[in-house]
């Protein structure tokens, strides 16, 4: 979020000042708030970063991560006869990123037009509200993937109906969960009207006030319980996850399963470093540099780790590739342009004239799609 | 001390072109945001345009639009205005100030001393 | 564009006099509001910024007030020095427009 110093330097960053005084109108006093906005802060909005650079990472995020995640949620949700806990959590983490994407045209617009916003306030919220709630949604909901990848190794079970509802009261938990801790975000009025420019910002400017004290204690608290806690139980989940797979035997089809396993890890591991630490991190670090010294220096960081938290859009279709044997079918045959009916009917023919040449049967598991859970 | 020492004024005649120069001294000049106003004869005050301190930006009146060009060189420390398409309107004296962008907004806090530009045939 | 309208045209004040000059917007303004003082010959010179704030090296008996479009500026215990014409600006919406001037002499 930028804000403006009241020192006209170059290289600092951005604190909104906020004048506290009050003006006496007809209808009583009122106390009007004001965002400062200095040469530092103005060239930050008017600058490359913010208008070129931004718009161009969410270009690809939206192309890259619209269609993926809208395959994603209809596979599962009309393609997968079996709906494992598995299913219903990336179900959820593609309905997330949906929800999130869907709004990055205008986001996109935004920052193309020189960080001037023309939809309203209400759009504004809704946008930042689902930014945000989208990167903690995507982080509980990995969690729960995470934990629940080791939990069938471990417990190697077949398909209950009481897990899957389980697995949706959890699901409906993390929603309910992260619209009551986005609700700040929709109630704190974010655009802002900038005269010097000529633009209202949409969150790019807040008033101190606020900022200071308010926004770094919420965003801490976000990053402890909503970033620190998910990942250490992720990162549980897969050291010991590494460790069953290691000391398991090892056949071509638990070898295959290993491979996929591993693959999952450093995709989830990546999305991590890439998305959610740097951009928890910096808005914790960015806020107390606020709220400490009056002014951030990492603000291109921040902006820029914030830009690169909406990549978990593009990474999540990777974990569901790794985890779902549907979605890989479907996957595989969008990229070929071919649907997977046909390679079914494929499947079938191939099998019945192996049949008609052999007298010895074969299993027709080849014309069912199987899940890998 | 902040120093702004505008050049350039003079008779030109209507449909003719003027550049201006400011030359900024006492400050670091690629960090302000800068324009310049005119005060025609007798008359109150009328801003003619703004640059951002990146250069990026540059803002005028409907008045100038087309005809003015906001221009700086950070090298030089210099502001200019190149004013084309001249008519009688725009005799005036023209002042080059630094400005303080606070509070979202231009605040014009330090001025130049003027030149005169008489447009007449 | 934003019409800014002062009034009185011109005023006389005695010596340490309070006097007050009025700017009008012709839509509210948010309180991006200026006053320039400028004395004859001179360059104008910022006295008040955002409607109250007083500009450094500016005496303390200048002060700004009001809010919308209603601003003023008020000048207590006039003194010699205070003469000249006062402009009031607009910084809220390009293009930024100024007062006619308000002319302030001493009695």
């Known amino acids: 979020t930028i804000q403006g110093t009241n020192r006209s330097s170059k290289g600092r960053s951005l604190i909104g000042k906020v004048d506290g005084t009050s003006h006496v109108t007809g209808k009583g006093v009122t106390v009007e708030t004001v965002f400062s906005v200095d040469e530092f802060s103005a060239s930050v909005l008017t600058g490359k970063l913010t208008t070129v650079f931004l718009p161009i990472v969410y270009t690809i995020v939206f192309v890259v991560g619209l269609p993926s995640n809208g395959m994603a949620l209809w596979v599962f949700l009309f393609r997968t006869k079996k709906k494992h806990p598995a299913v219903i959590y990336m179900a959820n983490l593609a309905l997330a990123d949906l929800l999130s994407v869907i709004w990055f045209p205008l986001k996109i617009a935004y920052h193309i037009h020189g960080n001037n916003w023309i939809y309203g306030e209400a759009l504004c919220n809704v946008l930042i509200g689902f930014f945000y709630g989208n990167m903690y949604c995507s982080i509980l909901f990995m969690t729960c993937l995470s934990v629940q990848r080791y939990w069938v190794i471990v417990n190697p079970m077949g398909h209950s109906r009481k897990k899957a509802n389980i697995a949706i009261g959890i699901s409906l938990a993390i929603w309910l969960l992260i619209l009551l801790v986005t609700i700040p975000l929709y109630v704190v009025k974010q655009t802002i009207f900038i005269p010097a420019l000529n633009i209202t910002t949409c969150h790019d400017v807040l008033p101190e006030q606020l900022l200071v004290g308010d926004m770094f204690n919420y965003f801490l608290s976000l990053a402890i319980g909503v970033f620190l806690f998910p990942a250490f139980l992720t990162a549980s989940a897969y050291v010991l996850m590494i460790r069953m797979l290691r000391s398991s035997a090892m056949d071509e089809n638990s070898e295959k399963k290993r491979k996929r396993a591993i693959k999952l890890i450093v995709t989830v591991l990546a999305m991590y470093l890439i998305c959610f630490t740097p951009s928890n991190l910096l808005l914790v670090v960015h806020y107390f540099l606020i709220k400490s010294q009056g002014q951030s220096h990492v603000y291109a960081l921040y902006i820029v780790a914030l830009c690169l938290s909406t990549l978990n859009s593009c990474i999540d279709p990777f974990v569901y590739y790794f985890v779902s044997h549907d979605f890989r079918d479907h996957a595989k045959n969008a990229l070929l342009c071919r649907s997977v009916r046909t390679v079914k009917q494929m499947q079938v023919s191939l099998t019945s004239k192996k049949h008609s040449r052999k007298s010895s049967s074969y299993s027709s598991s080849s014309t069912t799609v199987k899940t890998s859970y | 001390e902040v120093q702004l020492v505008e050049s350039g004024g003079g008779l030109v005649q209507p449909g003719r072109s003027l550049k201006l120069s400011c030359v900024a001294t006492?400050?670091?000049?690629?960090?302000?945001?800068m324009t310049w106003i005119r005060q025609a004869p007798g008359k109150g005050l009328e801003w003619v345009a703004s640059?951002?301190?990146?250069?990026?930006?540059?803002y005028y009146p409907d008045s100038v639009k087309g005809r003015f060009t906001i221009s700086r060189d950070d090298a030089k420390s210099t502001l200019y205005l190149q004013m084309n398409s001249l008519r009688s309107e725009d005799t005036a004296t023209y002042y080059c100030t630094r400005v303080r962008v606070y509070y979202g907004s231009n605040w014009f806090v330090y001025w130049g001393q003027g030149t005169l530009v008489t447009v007449s045939s | 564009d934003i019409q800014m309208t002062q009034s009185p045209h011109s005023l006389s004040a005695s010596l340490g006099e309070t006097v007050s000059i009025e700017c009008l917007a012709s839509e509210g303004i948010s309180n991006y509001l200026a006053w320039f003082q400028q004395k004859p010959g001179k360059s104008p010179q910022l006295l008040i910024y955002?409607?109250?704030s007083l500009q450094d090296g500016v005496p303390s008996r200048f002060s700004g007030s009001g809010s919308g479009t209603q601003y003023s500026l008020k000048i207590s215990n006039m003194q010699p020095e205070d003469e000249g014409v006062y402009y009031c600006q607009q910084g809220y919406k390009y293009p930024w427009t100024f007062g006619g001037g308000t002319k302030l002499e001493l009695k």
């Open positions: 640059i951002t301190n990146s250069g990026g930006n540059t």
């Open positions: 006492g400050f670091t000049f690629n960090n302000y945001w």
């Open positions: 955002y409607a109250s």
